[in-house]
Interface confidence: medium
């Protein structure tokens, strides 16, 4: 049999919540070797995929896909897959990104500390991941 | 049309063996589904065997059936589930099922009809 | 080993009653859930899934709601067509543990 592919890793810079009109960086990693990386958004029928993979380290390879400005329609739920000839592999664990008003207050801090899923990681104990979206009949819509 | 139909199930005897196919119609493996084993014992619950991923070739059992139950990915539309070692306990109507095309979160929306396995001497 | 336990094993209401089906997973699956339900000699058929999201085609009398690691299928405005066996699943292959596991079932009775 051939050798299994690791799940994906992703991972939100600078964070998981994300002031209206900032910007949001979503991070897939995986192993070395991949093709493509996909950040698929509620479920595997609308996605974006790109070939622009860099090494990170060396036995992990990322892509990175960026939300300039972020709307309130950007809030949901991400994931990463990744192609490595010939295989797709399994889906990362999610990731929930929040959009939230700009506050503007000095002592308001912009954004939570980066936040990630990975393969080692358990699903979050997180309650508010029940109010996924659904995303019914997309297919292969653009994320952003 | 998407469809997944078992195939295979069958009278057998005690220690005996059995091979069950699941045959997917409308859809292409390569897009990457879980293709699930649940079982059904006559007038119980709903029992999950595994699941392989139908790109990565990752395969995830229960406890209860590793060893003793083997999936695997045998062509680019059919997945099988391997039988060993069959006791009275194993009878039951096999499903295959395939997780969802359009929701995340991995339910098994398309099923099979089933088929029946009857382990008796 | 994830275990899954459903509550009640039965429960018997009237037509427009209520009928509350909770389900207990024995670790953290986040949203990981879906409820089916099935009818005798039929496969089942996909009602809830991520806890809380309505399949298509399934009546909004059913909701799914999470709290923690507790799952709560609850059926409003009873019909006769809902007498069925209710089971919750969950539906996360990971590599931390293994998931699938589904509950006992909810044999749900109209009177």
């Known amino acids: 049999q051939e050798e299994d592919l690791p799940r994906p890793s992703i991972s939100a810079e600078p964070g998981t919540v994300i002031p209206l009109g900032s910007h949001v960086t979503f991070v897939c990693r995986g192993p070395v070797g991949v093709q493509t990386f996909r950040l698929e958004r509620d479920s595997r029928s609308t996605y974006n995929d790109t070939e622009d993979v860099s090494q990170a380290s060396p036995s992990e390879s990322e892509a990175r896909f960026r939300i300039d400005s972020v709307r309130e329609g950007n809030a949901g739920l991400y994931r990463c897959i990744y192609y490595k000839p010939p295989k797709w592999s399994e889906q990362s664990d999610y990731l929930e990104l929040l959009v939230k008003e700009s506050s503007g207050g000095p002592d308001s801090p912009d954004t939570e500390p980066g936040s990630s899923a990975g393969p080692t990681q358990r699903p979050s104990d997180n309650s508010h991941n029940e109010h996924a979206p659904a995303s019914q009949g997309l297919k292969a819509e653009h994320l952003y | 049309e998407q469809s997944v139909e078992e195939s295979g199930g069958d009278l057998v005897k005690p220690e005996g063996s059995l091979t069950l196919t699941c045959t997917a119609s409308g859809f292409s493996f390569s897009s990457g589904y879980y293709m699930c084993w649940v079982r059904q014992a006559p007038g119980k619950g709903l029992e999950w065997i595994g699941c392989i991923h139908s790109s990565s070739g990752n395969i995830y059992y229960a406890s209860w059936a590793k060893g003793r139950f083997t999936i695997s990915k045998t062509s680019s539309t059919t997945v099988d589930l391997q039988l060993t070692s069959l006791t009275a306990a194993d009878t039951a109507t096999y499903f295959c099922?395939?997780?969802?095309?359009?929701?995340?979160?991995?339910?098994?929306?398309?099923w099979g009809p089933g088929t029946l396995v009857t382990v008796s001497s | 080993e994830l275990d899954m336990t459903q509550t009640p094993a039965s429960v018997s209401e009237p037509v427009g009653g209520t009928v509350t089906i909770k389900c207990q997973a024995s670790?953290?699956?986040?949203?990981?859930l879906a409820w089916y339900q099935q009818k005798p000699g039929q496969r089942p058929k996909l009602l809830i899934y991520g806890a809380s999201n309505l399949a298509s085609g399934v009546s909004s009398r059913f909701k799914g709601s999470r709290s923690g690691t507790q799952f709560t299928l609850t059926i409003t405005d009873l019909e006769c067509d809902d007498a069925a066996t209710y089971y919750c699943?969950?539906?996360?292959?990971?590599?931390?543990?293994?998931?699938?596991?589904f509950g006992g079932g909810t044999e749900v009775v109209v009177k």
């Open positions: 670790q953290s699956i986040s949203s990981y």
């Open positions: 099922a395939r997780d969802s095309e359009v929701y995340g979160w991995n339910p098994n929306d398309l």
């Open positions: 699943q969950c539906s996360y292959y990971g590599n931390s543990y293994v998931g699938g596991a």
